[in-house]
């Protein structure tokens, strides 16, 4: 008789999830010499231990602590790029500007990027059918708690000048409910972080508005200033040209505004 299984509103665990995590770990540790000491089997065991046999609406940051410990990594704290709703461009940027890092350029972020996972209470099975949706089901699900945990730690580690890439095409350029708005902003450390600089990425070809004057950016400035951190904002009118100029800063067209 097939066991009754809880139906959640979100997609199920990404197929071949264990193999994917293990393979990503091996690849990452091969590419990054400073992480060669990491035992990927132990990493997978710690990852699995965070959610297997646990109710997928009752996951805590504590559950991920063994994984956090194994994935401890030092990135230059003054080279951190945060992002909100514009992941692809942020990743394209750090692929070119190799001395800057998004969360997904760290081991833990790289392992989990674009993946979904959850288990079931009291069974060692991974649920490939459905997983809790943050809005419709519960916020303390394995995926949300993971990103909240790693995002908090990443923001806490940041220092000096921190950059954040924001999507100027969205109705809320700064969204208080995003991971950046709800977690990272509040975990930047005053005095340790001197300045948060927002890069507002324009979508439209002919969009010459100053999106740094957008009410949601003013809201971000207010939150940041109340935390005793300086705030700066720049419009990136031409993201394609911006990336090109990061690749070839000597290009004569790169002196003008991008």
């Amino acid at each position: 008789v097939p066991r009754w299984r809880q139906q959640w509103s979100g997609p199920g665990t990404t197929k071949r999830f264990p193999e994917t995590v293990l393979a990503r770990c091996v690849k990452y540790t091969e590419i990054h010499p400073e992480m060669r000491h990491v035992d990927c089997q132990s990493v997978w065991d710690a990852f699995k231990g965070a959610f297997i046999s646990k109710h997928p609406c009752n996951i805590t940051e504590e559950d991920y602590q063994p994984l956090m410990k194994l994935g401890t990594q030092t990135v230059p704290c003054n080279k951190i790029l945060l992002w909100s709703r514009i992941k692809d461009l942020a990743h394209q940027f750090t692929q070119v500007q190799r001395d800057m890092f998004t969360l997904e350029d760290t081991l833990l972020g790289y392992l989990a990027d674009d993946l979904t996972w959850c288990g079931e209470f009291n069974t060692s099975k991974i649920n490939y059918q459905s997983c809790p949706d943050w809005r419709k089901d519960c916020s303390n699900n394995p995926v949300s708690v993971f990103w909240k945990t790693v995002s908090r730690r990443f923001a806490e580690a940041a220092c000096d000048v921190v950059h954040v890439m924001l999507n100027g095409s969205r109705s809320k350029i700064f969204d208080k409910n995003s991971t950046f708005g709800s977690v990272e902003v509040h975990n930047l450390q005053p005095e340790k972080v001197q300045t948060l600089e927002a890069w507002v990425i324009h979508g439209g070809r002919e969009d010459s508005r100053d999106l740094c004057q957008d009410p949601t950016i003013k809201e971000l400035e207010s939150i940041i200033s109340k935390r005793n951190i300086q705030f700066s904002c720049k419009n990136i009118y031409r993201p394609d040209k911006f990336l090109q100029c990061v690749k070839n800063p000597e290009d004569s067209s790169c002196t003008s505004e991008i």
Partner: antibody, heavy 122, light 107 residues
């Protein structure tokens, strides 16, 4: 009123050590980040180091990294700079300064001590 | 680190003259630029913060302007007490840096 008084300067041989102190009064010391800034004779101002209000975070100029250590004792309202492996080029007047932050000002060094002279020579 | 370049390194002027000092940052520092005045044997004194804001007690003949990488300090009518060395300072980064200074001397 705000007062910062440096002490501990003097003549020291190359390779030697010295510990500077900065006694703060007239403000709630534990609420402010602090800086050390130096000025070689006849030269400009060079930032050396700063420390977070609670002492949990420090920055150093590349020229002193690994040799100088900034610290503070909030119970004594005192800032310190431990200087090891001193070189002739460390000869300067060392100032402590308060890091003031407000939304209107952003980050400034608003109050400075009168400085203490460190001479590194054999 | 961000380099700050001041010019000129020294200038001679008379009382009543209009004096302009420029400061250039090696990268965009937004509006996080402060100016200090230092007299011989004394500690520096904050004059202007965030490009153009006068610190309390500073006379209105001092003014600042600029943004991004290029900044200017202007003394509209030089007074005897203004003969001193002036420094720009970037506070965009936690590793604050100063310009090399501009010495304003009596002609």
């Amino acid at each position: 009123q705000v007062q910062l008084v440096e002490s501990g300067g003097g003549l020291v041989q190359p390779g030697g050590s010295l510990r500077l102190s900065c006694a703060a009064s007239g403000f709630t010391f534990s609420n402010y980040g602090m800086h050390w800034v130096r000025q070689a004779p006849g030269k400009g101002l060079e930032w050396v180091s700063n420390i977070r209000s609670d002492g949990s975070w420090t920055y150093y100029a590349d020229s002193v990294k690994g040799r100088f250590t900034i610290s503070r004792d909030n119970s004594k309202n005192t800032l310190y700079l431990q200087m090891n492996s001193l070189r002739a080029e460390d000869t300067a007047v060392y100032y402590c300064a308060r890091r003031y932050w407000s939304k209107s000002h952003a980050s400034v060094t608003d109050y400075w001590g009168q400085g203490t002279l460190v001479t590194v020579s054999s | 680190d961000i380099q700050m370049t001041q010019s000129p390194s020294s200038l001679s002027a008379s009382v009543g003259d209009r004096v302009t000092i420029t400061c250039r940052a090696s990268q965009d520092i937004s509006a996080f630029l402060n100016w200090y005045q230092q007299k011989p044997g004394k500690a520096p004194k904050l004059l202007i913060y965030k490009v153009s804001n006068l610190q309390s007690g500073v006379p209105s003949r001092f003014s600042g302007s600029g943004s991004g990488t290029d900044f200017t300090l202007t003394i509209s009518s030089l007074q005897p007490e203004d003969f001193a060395t002036y420094y720009c300072q970037q506070a965009y980064s936690g590793s604050i840096t100063f310009g090399q200074g501009t010495k304003v001397e009596i002609k």
